[in-house]
């Protein structure tokens, strides 16, 4: 922490300007008034303060705004944003997409995924929902950031906005997030023809239930293996060999490459070996011929 000293009269700061780069940390602490700093935040990012000097300026703002910075300050944080922790950002109320854009630009190239995720969360809360303008801003300035939102926040996405989401925006989404987004995508694309529908829905299929995957297998979609590997394990396990063959079409040969990886490995273990043999891929690990499978979970549910 910076030691408290009194400011010599000749060092008193009446405006935030470039000469402050020469102020030692203790001089900044003593001579820069927090209210002046907040009022002239728009000047701060034009001044190449060292990161240690920025620590001092942050400390001053923290003291002035213990409950969180106002958006007028947040908008102009610039490189000072790099000093913020997720805990700091959680105190903010952000509604302006211009503020979001400015801070996303600053964070580029820095390891700030937790801070950015928290910032986006605050924007969604501040705006009330994840509207089209917000999604457009995220896809333009922070590809992949959509997936930093919690499933609860993603549930506020109206289906009408889903069309603005690009495949690469979903690359880092986990199963719980896709569980939320998939039904919205299904609704958004429901009036499209078979092939067009599949192209649109494909990035969201990690959230699809078994019945929808089964339905796709009847539509000659020739699902690529990368998409198949992202399907929920629970959605893949009930599929028959014939259904998987129809679903993948010419891509079925890729199962051999993924034989040891989930969900393919788990699916193989549930299939009869003689059914697997019909694929002619040499897949091993299915249920040997002549064995009877008892699903005890069903019996327990009945008793």
């Amino acid at each position: 922490d910076v030691e408290r000293t009194t400011c010599p009269p000749e060092k008193e700061v009446h405006e935030i300007d470039e000469s402050l780069i020469f102020y030692k940390k203790r001089e900044l602490e003593a001579c820069v008034d927090a209210a002046l700093l907040a009022a002239q935040m728009d000047r701060v990012d034009a001044i190449p303060f060292t990161y240690e000097q920025l620590d001092v300026l942050k400390h001053k703002l923290d003291e002035l705004y213990p409950q969180g910075y106002p958006e007028s300050v947040i908008r102009h944080l610039g490189h000072l944003f790099l000093k913020m922790s997720p805990e700091d950002i959680r105190k903010w109320n952000v509604t302006s997409l211009e503020t979001l854009k400015a801070l996303l630009k600053v964070s580029k190239g820095h390891e700030m995924s937790a801070q950015v995720a928290t910032l986006i969360d605050r924007v969604v809360v501040g705006r009330g929902q994840l509207d089209k303008d917000t999604v457009d801003t995220l896809t333009a300035f922070c590809p992949g950031c959509l997936c930093s939102l919690s499933p609860e926040r993603l549930s506020s996405v109206p289906p009408s906005v889903i069309g603005a989401v690009r495949p690469q925006d979903l690359d880092t989404c986990g199963p719980r997030q896709l569980d939320v987004l998939y039904p919205k995508a299904r609704l958004a694309f429901q009036n499209m023809s078979g092939s067009e529908y599949f192209v649109k829905i494909r990035p969201f299929l990690g959230g699809a239930p078994t019945e929808d995957v089964k339905a796709l297998s009847q539509q000659n979609v020739s699902m690529d293996l990368a998409t198949f590997m992202k399907l929920r394990r629970e959605a893949v396990l009930p599929l028959t060999v014939a259904e998987v063959q129809k679903l993948l079409g010419p891509h079925v040969e890729g199962l051999k490459v993924e034989e040891q990886h989930s969900p393919v490995r788990d699916w193989i273990l549930k299939q009869r070996q003689d059914d697997l043999d019909t694929l002619g891929l040499g897949l091993q690990g299915g249920i040997p011929n002549g064995y009877l499978i008892l699903d005890l979970s069903v019996r327990e549910a009945l008793s």
Epitope: S19, I21, F22, P48, F49, T50, Q53
Partner: nanobody
Framework: EVQVVESGGGLVQAGASLRLSCASS????????MAWFRQAPGKERELVAG???????YYSDSVKGRFTISRDNAKNTVYLQMDSLKFEDTAVYFC?????????????????????WGQGTQVTVSS
């Protein structure tokens, strides 16, 4: 690559004046900061005066009111006018230029911030 060359040092009586010059070459854009540091025997290098790319100045407490830093853009030269010299001003004076793109260091008063340095010029003030 920026080259920095100081001149103007010498031996003077206490109370006299000297003007140090720092000629820089090697690029057309002004560095973010030009500064004069000094180092007395057995002591750390300390900032004497600094000048930003916009012309703002800064002086250490020990020289404020006696020293003036200025620049002649046409000649790519920074000056340090030293008046009312004291015995304590005796040191090797260094000119430094820096951009500090990584924003390292505690402040621009720290010598670690500057990428380009001259060889230094000796100033000796006799009492």
């Amino acid at each position: 690559e920026v080259q920095v060359v100081e001149s103007g040092g010498g031996l003077v009586q206490a109370g006299a004046s000297l003007r140090l010059s720092c000629a820089s070459s090697g690029r057309t854009i002004s560095p973010i900061a030009m500064a004069w540091f000094r180092q007395a025997p057995g002591k750390e290098r300390e900032l004497v005066a600094g000048l930003t790319w916009t012309g703002r100045t800064y002086y250490s407490d020990s020289v404020k009111g006696r020293f003036t830093i200025s620049r002649d853009n046409a000649k790519n030269t920074v000056y340090l006018q030293m008046d009312s010299l004291k015995f304590e001003d005796t040191a090797v004076y260094f000119c430094a230029a820096g951009d500090n793109p990584d924003r390292r260091g505690s402040s621009w008063s720290s010598s670690s911030v500057y990428e380009y340095w001259g060889q230094g010029t000796q100033v000796t003030v006799s009492s």
